[in-house]
């Protein structure tokens, strides 16, 4: 798997999308996990609803939300109030039994808020020793969720 880079601004929301073949992954729940080291395990952050037919319901774990468009084949993860410690390598996963298929490897980069004049030394970027070959950069422009916003796709 190539690694896709998503860049977000500290303090704002970052939306990560993971497209997949909806038929191939039909009936499978999804998860978002954080890679612990280059060869380490991927630690589960949040997973979709335990009933696959309700996968479109937004589920939160702390400041991270997940929602799955199972018909369209797009898993969406929202990292709210992005912080420097959120930077790192993640995976979108498709679950089947105790196994997990990787849908996409994601590198989250946290950029300094241009309106924030604090020391940018806290921000994390992949070092030269960490090679993410063929990494594709996606600048994700997202908005913060509004209070009381319905956690469902909009009506047509």
């Amino acid at each position: 798997h190539n690694t896709t880079v998503f860049q977000g601004v500290a303090g704002q929301s970052l939306q990560v999308s993971c497209p997949y073949d909806s038929m191939k992954h039909w009936g499978r729940r999804k998860a978002w996990c954080r890679q612990l080291g280059e060869k380490g395990p991927c630690q589960r952050v949040v997973s979709t609803h335990n009933l696959w037919l309700l996968s479109f319901l937004r589920r939160w774990n702390g400041s991270t939300a997940i929602t799955d468009d199972t018909l369209g084949g797009t898993l969406t993860i929202t990292l709210r109030n992005l912080q420097p410690h959120d930077a790192g390598l993640y995976q979108c996963q498709s679950l089947h039994g105790s196994e997990a298929d990787t849908l996409r490897k994601v590198l989250v980069e946290v950029l300094a808020d241009p309106l924030d004049h604090r020391d940018a030394g806290d921000l994390w970027f992949p070092g030269e020793s960490e090679s993410f070959e063929d990494a594709h950069v996606e600048h994700s422009i997202s908005r913060s969720l509004l209070e009381g916003e319905i956690p469902f796709p909009p009506t047509s």
Epitope: W26, G27, H49, N50, L51, W52, L53, L54, F56, L57, R59, W60, L71, I150, P151, F152, P153, P154, T155, S156
Partner: antibody, heavy 126, light 106 residues
Framework: EVQLVESGGGLVQPGRSLRLSCTAS????????MSWFRQAPGKGLEWVGF??????????EYTASVKGRFTISRDGSKSIAYLQMNSLKTEDTAVYYC?????????????????WGQGTMVTVSS | DIQMTQSPSSLSASVGDRVTITCQAS??????LNWYQQKPGKAPKLLIY???NLETGVPSRFSGSGSGTDFTFTISSLQPEDIATYYC????????FGGGTKVEIK
Amino acid sequence: EVQLVESGGGLVQPGRSLRLSCTASGFTFGDYAMSWFRQAPGKGLEWVGFIGSKAYGGTTEYTASVKGRFTISRDGSKSIAYLQMNSLKTEDTAVYYCARGKRYSYGYWHPAFDVWGQGTMVTVSS
Amino acid sequence: DIQMTQSPSSLSASVGDRVTITCQASQDITNYLNWYQQKPGKAPKLLIYDASNLETGVPSRFSGSGSGTDFTFTISSLQPEDIATYYCQQYDSYLTFGGGTKVEIK
């Protein structure tokens, strides 16, 4: 008029099978997820399972206590949802209701149930 | 599974009274909660969805509020036709109902 009518209930011995039907009218049946619930005499409501709209191709979900014994299916041409109940136990005795999930847009629905049938009684006893 | 604790299990109030029922979830369910009314011998009827949204055609004297683990259902002015059992239902994890609250007229 939007309506759901259940049928097929009755007295059945433990270990036997029974099939309930839920006939829908007044709405486009294929656009909606359909669910089954039950209510034991004098008790509260319990979700049994549901089946997705036509877009989901008959995908089903069940509560743990009936998984492997009960099967939900739907016939779009007749606008009927079925609940096939096998290996029935005395604790399955209840009024069984079918209900329609609220619809948001194509494929998307809401697990709030806005139309219910009148219910059909299932008694499992020897 | 998420447990839904509804209280009180029964109450008696006068016509015109404000009636409040609470539902507590065993863990955070955001606003994934619905309220139903069930009259004796009848099927349940959806009143409130997403914790606070009034279902179409339901009188405005019914309302719901809350998020996280604590939810409230209110009848602002009890009417004779409101005699029923009221249930909360969560859908954050599977689907489970509260034990119900039976509302009677004094």
